[in-house]
């Protein structure tokens, strides 16, 4: 079995639900901690949006461009 430390990195994306709008979800999560520049390795993570790094969780999160939704801002919002 693995070691038993607890995670700073939940890796459950703040805008992780495919049905949620990343921008909205991330905005709601501001109370959880601040954001920093995404590590370079996540440069291509957000498809139609901006990546930012959740400091408290050490994981990337996408802020979608208008009209896009999804964990990676990969889908057009048909209701936009």
């Amino acid at each position: 079995d693995g070691n038993s430390t607890r995670s700073p990195e939940t890796n459950g994306l703040l805008c992780g639900d495919p049905e949620e709008n990343c921008a909205a979800t991330t905005t709601q999560s501001k109370r959880k901690g601040h954001f920093s520049r995404c590590p370079k390795q996540y440069k291509h993570y957000c498809i139609k949006g901006r990546c930012r790094f959740v400091v408290a969780e050490q994981t990337p999160s996408c802020v979608c461009d208008e009209g896009y939704i999804g964990a990676r801002c990969e889908r057009v919002d048909l209701f936009y």
């Epitope: 430390t5 700073p8 992780g16 050490q58 964990a71 990676r72």
Partner: antibody
Framework: EVQLLESGGGLVQPGGSLRLSCAAS????????ISWVRQAPGKGLEWVSY????????NYADSVKGRFTISRDNSKNTLYLQMNSLRAEDTAVYYC?????????WGQGTLVTVSS | DIQMTQSPSSLSASVGDRVTITCRAS??????LGWYQQKPGKAPKLLIY???SLQSGVPSRFSGSGSGTDFTLTISSLQPEDFATYYC????????FGQGTKVEIK
Amino acid sequence: EVQLLESGGGLVQPGGSLRLSCAASGFTFSRYWISWVRQAPGKGLEWVSYIDSWGSYTNYADSVKGRFTISRDNSKNTLYLQMNSLRAEDTAVYYCARGGSLFDYWGQGTLVTVSS
Amino acid sequence: DIQMTQSPSSLSASVGDRVTITCRASQGIISYLGWYQQKPGKAPKLLIYAASSLQSGVPSRFSGSGSGTDFTLTISSLQPEDFATYYCQQYDALNTFGQGTKVEIK
């Protein structure tokens, strides 16, 4: 209790293939990025690959790019590493670890030996 | 690729000693750095993340500092269970580890 259990290691000839599995329990697997990290005998740690929680985003170390493929089945709480065109230098203990940037839980590893 | 260089590669110390391990990145990585401890035959254990944040459950005698290219792991008072190999890892560009520092009993 978080647990990661690797399997599928063994002896394989150069040029051969192997598929490793990592069974996860004790946490919501589908919410987490997961990685493979390897360690050659008596050597240091080398990150191999990661996959995001949805299985839609992957990255690989240059040393394995084009030969290894990471995937996951969230319905089975299982991570995979398909290894093709294996080389002697791929001989290592392969760990699955929770996280994409940092690795907070690790399995105990499975040994892959590439030799003729 | 970003190279991570640890020094020293090994050191001998006694229980109660203050131990410092350094890690240098070949280019700036802000504070995207973690430290791990590994004992023989065991999986690594995360000690420090974001250069200076202590992982939950890790004793406070461990601390990390630095940003940019130069980083330090300090063990304020070495305990018997601290004899192990320590690795730094950057996660700005694709994840890479240092070569390790083995802390042995003097």
